[in-house]
Each structure stands twice: as C-alpha cells, then as structure tokens.
Amino acid sequence: KSSSEATNITPKHNMKAFLDELKAENIKKFLHNFTQIPHLAGTEQNFQLAKQIQSQWKEFGLDSVELTHYDVLLSYPNKTHPNYISIINEDGNEIFNTSLFEPPPAGYENVSDIVPPFSAFSPQGMPEGDLVYVNYARTEDFFKLERDMKINCSGKIVIARYGKVFRGNKVKNAQLAGATGVILYSDPADYFAPGVKSYPDGWNLPGGGVQRGNILNLNGAGDPLTPGYPANEYAYRRGMAEAVGLPSIPVHPIGYYDAQKLLEKMGGSASPDSSWRGSLKVPYNVGPGFTGNFSTQKVKMHIHSTSEVTRIYNVIGTLRGAVEPDRYVILGGHRDSWVFGGIDPQSGAAVVHEIVRSFGTLKKEGWRPRRTILFASWDAEEFGLLGSTEWAEENSRLLQERGVAYINADSSIEGNYTLRVDCTPLMYSLVYNLTKELESPDEGFEGKSLYESWTKKSPSPEFSGMPRISKLGSGNDFEVFFQRLGIASGRARYTKNWETNKFSSYPLYHSVYETYELVEKFYDPMFKYHLTVAQVRGGMVFELANSVVLPFDCRDYAVVLRKYADKIYNISMKHPQEMKTYSVSFDSLFSAVKNFTEIASKFSERLRDFDKSNPILLRMMNDQLMFLERAFIDPLGLPDRPFYRHVIYAPSSHNKYAGESFPGIYDALFDIESKVDPSQAWGEVKRQISVATFTVQAAAETLSEVA
C-alpha cells in the first residue's frame, strides 16, 4: 500500500498506473530499432545510438538527459591482419586454418562493421606448440590435470570449452599453469540443446558460430589504465605493463566445426571421466599433442589484435524526486553489443526505454516520484563494465551518500521458462510482494500470479512455498554499485529451465546470430516475457523511488547471515585438528550474527510503529535502511582485490559470474591443505573471521536506536 500514498502531488498515480502504461508492442518496436546494425563500444554507430536515446528520453519527459564520456582502453582485431589458428606440419606449412569470420545470417550479408570473433584484450603473439585439452579450464580442471594426471601445461597451448565459469577465469588459470596460449571453443554439449535446430531454423548454435567476449581479470577496477579514478581528460594513465587485469598470453575463440579439426587428432592421456567429454565425435584425449600419425604436427596461433584508448559514452537521464531529490534510485543497463545484440543487451535496453517512456508519461501528467530516479545507458560493458564503473568512480562521493538502490537491466531474457532474480537480501520482500501482484506470462498459469509460477518452476532450496533468489556475483553493471560502493542492488530476467537445459548461457550468446529475429521468432514472439521483466524491473524502481518507507527488510539479511556463517563454519570444520592447533573459532562471528538478528528484529518493530508523518524521523529511519548495505563495505577491500569491498558477498575468485558469501574467509580456507605454511594460512583464516565479525557487528549497530 505504501506506493499509493507516495506523494501528495498526485496520489492517483500509483504503481498500477505506471505498470498499465508499459506495452509489449513498444518493447518489440524498440528492440527492432536497436538491433539493425552493430553497436560495438567505441564505434561511431554506438555514439549515434547514444544520441538517439538521449533525444528520445528527453521526448519521453525526463528532466535532463546528458552524455558522459570517458577515454578507456578497448581492444579490436586488426582489420588487415586477421586472427586465426592453424595446424602446421613439420615443415611449418599451414595444413588447416580456422575461419576468419562467422557466416552472416540471412538478410545481414551486406551489413558492414561486423567485428569478427576475437577475445578482447588478448595480447598479440604467434605461439606454437602441442595442444592440451583442459575441459572448462576451471580451478578443479587444472587440479585434475596437474595433481592427478601429472600433465604439465607449461609451454603448451591449451584448448578449453566455454561454459560453467567466466572466460577470464579460464585464461587466468591457464596462465598460472604456464600455458603459452588459450583456444576457447563452444562445445555442442554446452551450446546445442537436444531437439532444437541451429539458427536460423532454431535457437541453437551453428558450427560456424563463435562466442566473443573479454578475457580480463579486472576484479572491479574498471578501465585498466585508471583504476579507482574516472578516465577523464586529466586522468593519469598507467603504462600497458602496469595495466590492471590484462592477460599475458594470446587467446582466441572458435566454433565447434573448427574445434573438431583440432580435437580429433588429440593423443596423449585419455579424458579422466565423462564430465570431461563433450558432444563432438572426437576422443576428448587430453594430450599433450596429437596422436601417432600426427604427432609431428603443431598448433600455431596468429593473434594481431590491438588495444587502444577510445572514447565511450554513457547516457544519464534524471527524473527529479519531489520530496527527497537527494536520494537516488538507479536503473541502468548497457547499450554496447558485440554485434547486433538481439538479446545482449538490447532486450534489456528496449525494456529500459519503455520504462522511461512510462515514467515520462506519468511525469507529463503532473506526477513525480518521491525520490530521484536516474536512468543509465552504459557503454563498454562488454569490455569490462567500463562505462558504469567510470561513471560510478566519477560520482562515487554522491553515490555513497545518496544511493538508495541500483536495479540492473541487461538482457531481459536468457530463456522463456521462468523468472530469475539475484539481489541483496534487503530486496527479497520487495520482490516477493511485487511478483504476487503481477500476472504470470507462463502457459498453464493464466490468471495466476508471477510469484506462483516462479515458485513452482524455481523453488527455493531452503524455504518451501517460496521461489529461489540467488546471490549477486558479477559480470554485469551492478558490480561497482554493489561490490565497491555498497548500494543495495538487484537484477531480474526471464531464464531457461536449468533442470533440463544444461548448456551454459544461451547458445547464441555473443555471436552474430543474436538478432532481432532470434527473439521474435524463437524466444518471445508476443514479447510477453519482456513485458513481465519490464514490470518487475520497473515495479522495483517505482517502489524504491516512491514508498514512503524504503521497501527494505533487514530481517532477511539476518537470516542469510546465519546461513552463510553456518556454511563457512562447516567448510572450516573439515579441518578439526587445525582449528584446534591454531585456535580457530567462529564463536565471535556467530555472536555478531546473533546480535545483528536481535537488533534487526527490534529495528523492524520500531519501523512498524514510528510516526510516519514526522519527516525527520522518517528520514532517519530510511537513512538507517539505506546505509545498511553500505555498512558491509570494508574500505580496505578483500585481499588482492581492493575494489571488491563487500564483506558478505563478492564474485567468486574461481568464477566472476558467481557470488560467494563471506568471500574473505572462503578464499582463506580454499585448498588450505595444499598451503606450504599452515601457521600463516590459518592465521589468515583467523584474520578474515575477525574482519567478518567486526563488519557484521558494526552493521548491526547502524540499526540500533541512534541515541
């Protein structure tokens, strides 16, 4: 009910009016408009789209819409010197070369500036050597190779299949193993769902399709040359040798037709078990090198990409709040794409566009939100979340004092099965309440709520009758807001059935085949899932900006803190003797969590009972809610990851996409039995328990009565 009494200007404009204004037909039209040509970061086409969006947001009625530019490090293939991989014989002759481009989809043959598949930020190089197949190139895959199979990757070119973890982690692992180059490929086991045809006849990846993507390990730094500071005209830039997160070995992606040619000749050790075998008709031997007849043949990479400082443009739109203009609710998603961006990002950008249009319509009728809403079209997300991070670095002092919430709006769909939400625990109740009010778009759930279909299809593993909400990881533009600045954040999209579809991401992710037609023909012909996502994202923004009392429930944080403390304690208890030897105790952490739980409960009672008509008291309580997420930030950051500062959540050190809880303790405990100096290793565990305890206790105290 909170939003219906949102402002005293036009109370008739409640959330229903906002939601009713959202139209599937408009989202469809916007998506078509945004996907006719490539919008690669740093290109003229993407600058023109930024100006178009600026113009349209102004027309829609926002108070102001500005372009903010930064000069950041980007990476492009050399137009005259293409990247490829070859098999060479003993005379050095190339007997096989991988393809130089993806065959363009029908109707797009004459489109210019389709960037060929490449691994952004790969250094130049022409390494040559034997191949080692490393499965997904995860930490555990290299453990298996090095520890169990005694296979040494030093001096070898490794070939890894895409999937399971962020590609940058794969490259980092390969570097640490001593590899001289990395070939990434899409295996049909991960990118070809059974019973579905290849594009253009279905949504599966054809053999010539390739996933582009950056291979950085930025750990939240933003522009590699200006970590911590905006890449503006007076910025000091590091030299390339000191740049953050750049890979040190050449990397290149290929499709499964080309991968077949490389993998079919592999010799050496057999794959350790079925989890290492994909769906190609090859033996999946690990190597090193080719089998008998082909043992004198080598693999050679030819990588000539260049990294260059390039101008990027964000679009920032403002809808000024009527009551608390100095409190910001942000809705942001990126605009840059690898090629056409049919799903990533334009299915999200089209939804943001329609949300802006709906808010603008209400504003033209005299309504204003209680708090200021900022809308952002980020640039260069695909190159390392650069646009959002640079803007947040430039505005960090404002954001840390005024930022209420950030809602992310990348791809609206990665499937059409059910809703997927990742958010701070503070937003759980907001999401539950909102989805109970929205209609499900799912077949078989006509007239039922979104909450009901979501709960049925994606049940919580812990709480029966409730849907699953996941931890925030990274790999998208919320990263700087949540992990660095401690602003409550959330994201929502429609997803696949993870039970039956085991492939990673959607098959055509980051390929030339991610087109408007892919969405319109195969994923969402009626754009009903897009509309639902618009309602969820827009509804969250509306409530966050308009509720008299912020729709955050601190008791939900208390519940997960206990769960995470139990989990990390159980991991540590796999080493009972060391815990005794080195006096490792989690008592202090459990005590802090207990204090947090009690204080959160009392705070919630006060929140329920206080006089909402007292503006000072209202602002005070809302500030305690707004600053709670901020209280989990450690200014010193996590070990070796200074821009990941949230003590409760961080991107996993082994997979940027995944979130890890109590990451400082988790990383200190990870593989601790292989640490040479146990006293030092367990000392670090104790230090991290201490940091976590202090942080939880300090956060609890921000919820105590102020005096």
Partner: antibody, heavy 116, light 107 residues
Framework: EVKLEESGGGLVQPGGSMKLSCVAS????????MNWVRQSPEKGLEWVAE??????????HYAESVKGRVIISRDDSKSSVYLQMNNLRAEDTGIYYC???????WGQGTTLTVSS | NIVMTQFPKSMSISVGERVTLTCKAS??????VSWYQQKPEQSPKMLIY???NRFTGVPDRFTGSGSATDFILTISSVQTEDLVDYYC?????????FGGGTKLEMK
C-alpha cells in the same frame, strides 16, 4: 603442533622386506598428502614415494629407483602412513623420514640398514 | 629428472658475516623451490618455500630469492647455530629432487 613419528626401521638382509610406519598428530591427517624421503651419505636426500588424500583417490607416486619394490599406503582412521619395502638392496640403506606435503614437516626418521 | 646443484659444497665463515648459498636447477622450475636447514642428528627443517617465502618461525636473517633455474639463500648475519647443513629442493614436478647440500663451517 604437527608431529610425525616413524618406526619400523632396523637391519635387514638384501632381498628381504620391511614395513615402515609413521603416525601423525596435530593436524587433520585425512586431508593431507604424505611422503617418504630418505637420506644416505652416498645419495643425500632422496624422495621415495607420495600418497595423496581420498579426494585425490589416494593416488600414489614413486621414485624410479624403488618402483615395483615399494608400496606406500595410509590408514586415515589411524592417522598413519606406511612404506612396505620388498626385495631390499644395499643402496636402500638410510634414514627414512615421513614428511607432509611439500616436505614442510618432517619426522625424526627411522634407520633402515640393508646388509648381509 | 630435474637435477638440483648446490654450491659451494662447503664454506668457512665467521659469525656476523653475510653468506650466500646458491642452487641451480637443470631446467625451469618456476618458483617451486624450498630451502631446508639440517642440524646434526636432526631431521631437515623448512626455512623458505616458493623460492622467497619465509616459513613460520624462521628468523628474518634468512632470505630466499630467484626463479626459473637460479636460486639463492642469503643469511644476512650468520649466528653460531646457523653453522649447519642447507639443502634446496624442487617440488615442480616428479620426481621431487634435492640438492647435494652446502655445509657451513666456522672459519
């Protein structure tokens, strides 16, 4: 505190057998890879064998000089690691140390003498 | 097998002197090199691991450096109790191998 205590050494004739034992304490034994390393005036320090933990399927590795003649094993319930040595030779003489992974902790050693 | 060669085999020094012990690997072993100290009638004790990390409890007069094939153990100011045997070892690949040792003696 980490403690490793070897036993089972002694005098044995060439061609004979001997089983060395090592009992560990002060750490969660089942998580750790264990080694045997020997020392003699002639050959200095020489790694003999390694046995890994259950999570690594108790994988074993041996030095070329002992392959086929020795078996490393472990009993996690007893926090113990063993070295069964068969077909012993004079050059197997030395002090045998039980060590933890990376050779970061060593026992006091047990002496094996192979002589007729 | 990777051969670890230590030199000198022995050296005579005075208390308070700075001493440098050298270890050379026959092929690249990254930084997977440890240094051990062995006192008479005792088992070896780890001093340095990962080429340059001091093991817990080791006095800071002991410093390790190097990578790939060349490694150094430096004792900044030798104490009487340091006049014992020192070994380097590699754990980069099987079989793990050790150097022949360097004996420090009183001048």
């Amino acid at each position: 505190e980490v403690k490793l205590e070897e036993s089972g050494g002694g005098l044995v004739q060439p061609g004979g057998s001997m089983k060395l034992s090592c009992v560990a304490s002060g750490f969660t034994f089942s998580n750790y890879w264990m080694n045997w390393v020997r020392q003699s005036p002639e050959k200095g320090l020489e790694w003999v064998a390694e046995i890994r933990s259950q999570s690594n399927n108790f994988a074993t590795h041996y030095a070329e000089s002992v392959k086929g003649r020795v078996i490393i094993s472990r009993d996690d319930s007893k926090s113990s690691v063993y070295l069964q040595m068969n077909n012993l030779r004079a050059e197997d003489t030395g002090i045998y140390y039980c060590t933890r992974r990376w050779n970061n902790f060593w026992g006091q050693g047990t002496t094996l003498t192979v002589s007729s | 097998n990777i051969v670890m060669t230590q030199f000198p085999k022995s050296m005579s020094i005075s208390v308070g002197e700075r001493v440098t012990l050298t270890c050379k690997a026959s092929e690249n072993v990254g930084t997977y090199v440890s240094w051990y100290q062995q006192k008479p009638e005792q088992s070896p004790k780890m001093l340095i691991y990962g080429a340059s990390n001091r093991f817990t409890g080791v006095p800071d007069r002991f410093t390790g450096s190097g990578s790939a094939t060349d490694f150094i153990l430096t004792i900044s100011s030798v104490q009487t109790e340091d006049l014992v045997d020192y070994y380097c070892g590699q754990s980069y690949t099987f079989p793990y191998t050790f150097g022949g040792g360097t004996k420090l003696e009183m001048k």
